[in-house]
Amino acid sequence: EPPTACREKQYLINSQCCSLCQPGQKLVSDCTEFTETECLPCSESEFLDTWNRETRCHQHKYCDPNLGLQVQQKGTSETDTICTCEEGLHCTSESCESCVPHRSCLPGFGVKQIATGVSDTICEPCPVGFFSNVSSAFEKCRPWTSCETKDLVVQQAGTNKTDVVCGPQDRQRA
């Protein structure tokens, strides 16, 4: 009785269960009653990352420097090349097919998380007591100056974009 289903790492072809090709190899010819599945290794620039019956290996991803990409991890016969972005850039998608410059946090916002090759800068509003007066991809919100510790008084209140202005205390006359 011909099989209708096959074991793991097998496939059904013309009423016969054949072994799948292992990762890193492609299918050349299905098995027969007498012969095992014919598989061939992928060439140097190709890969297959699963047990498969593919007749063609997949091309390794090309990390195009014109798109700001560089190789993070070279591909093997079983894995694809992993691209990342050059410094100052990050991927536009999970598959990292192109790069864009990191976002800068505007005045009033500070860097919560510095960008990586795969993720953009994360900005946060400066809370009360903190400010940022620059547009930057690196700088966090800075705390207002503490006038008191300098024996000074606040002459101008700080905002999320400006520091406080300290001045000397008014001397009271006797």
Epitope: N14, T32, E38
Partner: antibody, heavy 117, light 109 residues
Amino acid sequence: QVQLVESGGGVVQPGRSLRLSCAASGFTFEKYGMHWVRQAPGKGLEWVAVISYEGTSKYYADSVKGRFTISRDNSKNTLYLQMNSLRAEDTAVYYCARDTSRGHDIWGQGTMVTVSS
Amino acid sequence: EIVLTQSPGTLSLSPGERATLSCQASQSVSYNYLAWYQQKPGQAPRLLIYGASSRNNGIPDRFSGSGSGTDFTLTISRLEPEDFAVYYCQQYSDYPPFTFGGGTKVEIK
């Protein structure tokens, strides 16, 4: 390169025995089924026998069943055909051929067997 | 047993002409497991077509196979001098035995 080379042919008297060999090279012999196919002088191709890659499954043509035995030694990359009780009608060129789902994709050059008194 | 009948027995043609060879099976060939082989004098057969219509590696595209069920055809679109030979069909779906047709000789006219 992928190659099959037959040997062991010759002239033999009716009723006698002969053993043919087929040496394989250039491929993973132990993964492939192997066939013997023969061709009488001036005639067409006739399938003789097949053996599975590990040697457990064997089939024969009715014309040779009970007289011929196909076997293999994977450690030596060699296929054999033991031919007993030979008859005049067994006179032919004997080819070994590799089994695939595409048919017989690689053939040897053949070895001539002549059964004559 | 599947009996394969090839016709014609001999085909006399000139180089550049089209050759059409027929192979008829006594019962349906499952999964189109039918192959065509070319044999020249003093040489071993060579696999041309498998699965009724797929060309084997390195076979020129002037060779093509077609058909299914019980009727199969090998076509050589433009005969080259090296194509004059004997052609055999073989079924490998129903065995034992693996059966061959009687052959068609393509000769120079």
